[in-house]
């Protein structure tokens, strides 16, 4: 089948005091192979500072997954979500406040 790039959506939510949980969701992609990870200052975090969801079918013939991590409030600008799919890659910042970003990765 043809390649379908993911929609990437970064959200934030309050965690414990002084911390926030940032979640990066990728959806609507095909094939299922994808790299999704959080980076701090451009360096990927280790496996034990991130939580991954399974790559699951979304019912439309495409797939979805997510990765989350907990960070200190005020350091959001140091973190980005890195996505690689079918030879293309993109980085996605943490939104400020309670807003969220989502956009397609363009080939």
């Amino acid at each position: 089948g043809s390649t379908v790039p993911p929609m990437v959506n970064v959200t934030r939510s309050e965690a414990s005091e002084g911390n926030i949980t940032v979640t990066c969701r990728a959806s609507g992609f095909y094939p299922w192979n994808i790299t999704l990870s959080w980076r701090q200052d451009g360096v990927s975090l280790s496996h034990d500072t991130q939580q991954w969801g399974d790559v699951l079918p979304d019912g439309n013939g495409t797939y979805q997954t997510w990765v989350a991590t907990r960070i200190c409030q005020g350091e959001e600008q140091r973190f980005t979500c890195y996505m690689e799919h079918s030879g293309n890659h993109s980085t996605h910042p943490v939104p400020s406040g309670n807003s969220h970003h989502h956009h397609h990765h363009h080939h």
Partner: antibody, heavy 121, light 107 residues
Framework: EVQLVESGGGLVKPGGSLKLSCAAS????????MYWVRQTPEKRLEWVAT????????YYSDSVRGRFTISRDNAENTLYLQMSSLKSEDTAMYYC??????????????WGQGTSVTVSS | DIQMNQSPSSLSASLGDTITITCHAS??????LSWYQQKPGNIPKLLIY???HLHTGVPSRFSGRGSGTGFTLTISSLQPEDIATYYC?????????FGSGTKVEIK
């Protein structure tokens, strides 16, 4: 002093089940990721499963997913590995290990003595 | 999955020699590489984490270097108690993967 003591291994027939336990002491158990790693008779090390500090997240190798379940009891400072539908290729020494936390990110800083699992008819 | 190619599979050296063991990752793992020592009949023990940081109590003759895909473990002034098998482990992402091991013997 960190101590990890595994138990529950033994000889089991193919298709059978076993439950491994790992009693932890010497550290705040609930604060750390915990792991099961096995060593095959050929001495290869294989990661089996991980459970996060808050019990929320579990991860499995493809070779055991759907057959093994990792769990923990933070009140009892104990890690478990429920193994079912066992196969001959699951024969190994099973080690419980502690995640390095913020001082040794991405590493397994302490290991138990291991418990042996043999799957044979 | 990230493959860890460890070499050599075995080596023989004289007491006092400096030896180097290499691990190559099939993709970028940044600094999330740890080294373990397993003496005959014993359990694996952490030597180095984060590619270059010495674990508590490990002698300073052990050192680690590298980032990205290439990593080395060096033992300077080889001692009798260093007879063991050494393994690398990538801690970048799941599934966690070990190198196949390097058995170190004394000539």
């Amino acid at each position: 002093e960190v101590q990890l003591v595994e138990s529950g291994g033994g000889l089991v027939k193919p298709g059978g089940s076993l439950k491994l336990s790992c009693a932890a002491s010497g550290f705040t158990f609930s604060d750390y990721y915990m792991y099961w790693v096995r060593q095959t008779p050929e001495k290869r090390l294989e990661w089996v499963a991980t459970i996060s500090d808050g019990i929320t997240y579990t991860y499995y190798s493809d070779s055991v997913r759907g057959r093994f379940t990792i769990s923990r009891d933070n009140a009892e400072n104990t890690l478990y590995l429920q193994m079912s539908s066992l196969k001959s290729e699951d024969t190994a020494m099973y080690y419980c290990s502690k995640g390095g936390g913020s001082t040794a990110r991405g590493a397994l800083d302490f290991w138990g003595q291991g418990t042996s699992v043999t799957v044979s008819s | 999955d990230i493959q860890m190619n460890q070499s050599p599979s075995s080596l023989s050296a004289s007491l006092g020699d400096t030896i180097t063991i290499t691990c190559h990752a099939s993709q970028n793992i940044h600094v999330w590489l740890s080294w373990y020592q397993q003496k005959p009949g014993n359990i694996p023990k952490l030597l180095i984490y984060g590619a270059s940081h010495l674990h508590t109590g490990v002698p300073s003759r052990f050192s680690g270097r590298g980032s990205g895909t290439g990593f080395t473990l060096t033992i300077s002034s080889l001692q009798p108690e260093d007879i063991a098998t050494y393994y690398c482990l990538q801690g970048q992402s799941y599934p966690l993967t070990f190198g196949s091991g390097t058995k170190v013997e004394i000539k």
